[in-house]
Interface confidence: low
């Protein structure tokens, strides 16, 4: 899986979309998890409604929401009031039994609030994974990924 970069501004909301083949994943619940370490497990943050037919209903866990358009094949995650500690590597997953298939690997990056006049020297925060040769930016705010920059886990 290539990694897709989504960038958001601290304090604002960030919407992450994960497209998938609706037929291949028919009847499956979805989840959003955070990668713990470069090779660590993916810790569940939030999952869609227990009843697959109600997957369109938005479910929240803290400041993170998930909703699934099962016909169109798009899982949408909203990170509300984005904070630096939200930066890191995540996965959109399709669940079947005790197994989970990765739909998309997502790198969330948090940009400093341009109206925050504190030192804005280090705008980039935790967590790359996989090769970034093919990573692409899905948000209107973009940056070029440093050549050769290697996977690291979220830090705190």
């Amino acid at each position: 899986h290539n990694t897709t970069v989504f960038q958001g501004v601290a304090g604002q909301s960030l919407q992450v979309s994960c497209p998938y083949d609706s037929m291949a994943h028919w009847g499956r619940r979805k989840a959003w998890c955070r990668q713990l370490g470069e090779k660590g497990p993916c810790q569940r943050v939030v999952s869609t409604h227990n009843l697959w037919l109600l997957s369109f209903l938005r479910r929240w866990n803290g400041s993170t929401a998930i909703t699934d358009d099962t016909l169109g094949g798009t899982l949408t995650i909203t990170l509300r009031n984005l904070q630096p500690h939200d930066a890191g590597l995540y996965q959109c997953q399709s669940l079947h039994g005790s197994e989970a298939d990765t739909l998309r690997k997502v790198l969330v990056e948090v940009l400093a609030d341009p109206l925050d006049h504190r030192d804005a020297g280090d705008l980039w925060f935790p967590g790359e994974s996989e090769s970034f040769e093919d990573a692409h930016v899905e948000h209107s705010i973009s940056r070029s990924l440093l050549e050769g920059e290697i996977p690291f886990p979220p830090t705190s």
């Epitope: 370490g37 470069e38 090779k39 660590g40 930066a87 990056e109 280090d122 980039w124 925060f125 935790p126 967590g127 790359e128 990924l145 440093l146 050549e147 050769g148 920059e149 290697i150 690291f152 886990p153 979220p154 830090t155 705190s156």
Partner: antibody
Framework: QVQLQQSGPELVKPGASLKISCKAS????????MNWVKQRPGKGLEWIGR????????NYNGEFRVRATLTADTSSTTAYMQLSSLTSEDSAVYFC????????????????WGQGASVTVSS | DVVMTQTPLSLPVSLGDQASISCRSS???????????LHWYLQKPGQSPKLLIY???NRFSGVPDRFSGSGSGTDFTLKISRVEADDLGVYFC?????????FGGGTKLEIK
């Protein structure tokens, strides 16, 4: 305690292949990157690549990508480096070295090194 | 690739003196996660390299506090406050911010 025990010295002919082993003990082998580093006599250190034994994931230094193959056997906690089409330029000491990881903010430094495997390529 | 340049090549010191080794990288070593993956190793004759300092300024376990690392971005320094006979050898800086990992050419610390 962490130990990396490498195979012994080798004398090989030009054009031949060679497989060096690195037996790890004293830590969770599967979940730590293993690096391989080359040092020619009187020279500096050159990174060849790394392997994550847990899933076989590898990264290589471009110039070694064609001739070096990194593998790992989790059952015997041993990492291997195979070098093919050897030339005199490959005469060197080869080290295996574990990547130190201390979450959060993992260090990604090589904290434990094998004793080195000396390779001489000569006809 | 990131090129690491160490100076001086050779550093003659008297025991008890302070020694300072410089390491410069061709690109910034600040990773996008905010950390700087610059490390220092010591290789004594006939031995494997040993980790001294990781991530610019963190002493590895068992390393005396006479050793200290500093710097940021592209310029880094290793200082040995009071050189002892056991400190002699070749010092290498290394970066692991980007693949391929790269090493400096080494600085040989020797008795004056």
């Amino acid at each position: 305690q962490v130990q990396l025990q490498q195979s012994g010295p080798e004398l090989v002919k030009p054009g031949a292949s060679l497989k060096i082993s690195c037996k790890a003990s004293g830590y969770a082998f599967s979940s730590s990157w293993m690096n391989w580093v080359k040092q020619r006599p009187g020279k500096g250190l050159e990174w060849i690549g790394r392997i994550y034994p847990g899933d076989g994931d590898t990264n290589y230094n471009g110039e070694f990508r064609v001739r070096a193959t990194l593998t790992a056997d989790t059952s015997s906690t041993t990492a291997y480096m195979q070098l093919s089409s050897l030339t005199s330029e490959d005469s060197a000491v080869y080290f295996c070295a574990r990547l130190l990881r201390n979450q959060p903010g993992e260090s990604y430094a090589m904290d434990y090194w094998g004793q080195g495997a000396s390779v001489t390529v000569s006809s | 690739d990131v090129v690491m340049t160490q100076t001086p090549l050779s550093l003659p010191v008297s025991l008890g003196d302070q020694a300072s080794i410089s390491c410069r990288s061709s690109q910034s070593l600040v990773h996008s996660n905010g950390y700087t993956y610059l490390h220092w190793y010591l290789q004594k004759p006939g031995q494997s390299p040993k980790l001294l300092i990781y991530k610019v300024s963190n002493r590895f376990s068992g390393v005396p506090d006479r050793f200290s690392g500093s710097g940021s971005g592209t310029d880094f320094t290793l200082k040995i406050s009071r050189v002892e006979a056991d400190d002699l050898g070749v010092y290498f800086c290394s970066q692991s911010t980007r693949v391929p990992y790269t090493f400096g050419g080494g600085t040989k610390l020797e008795i004056k």
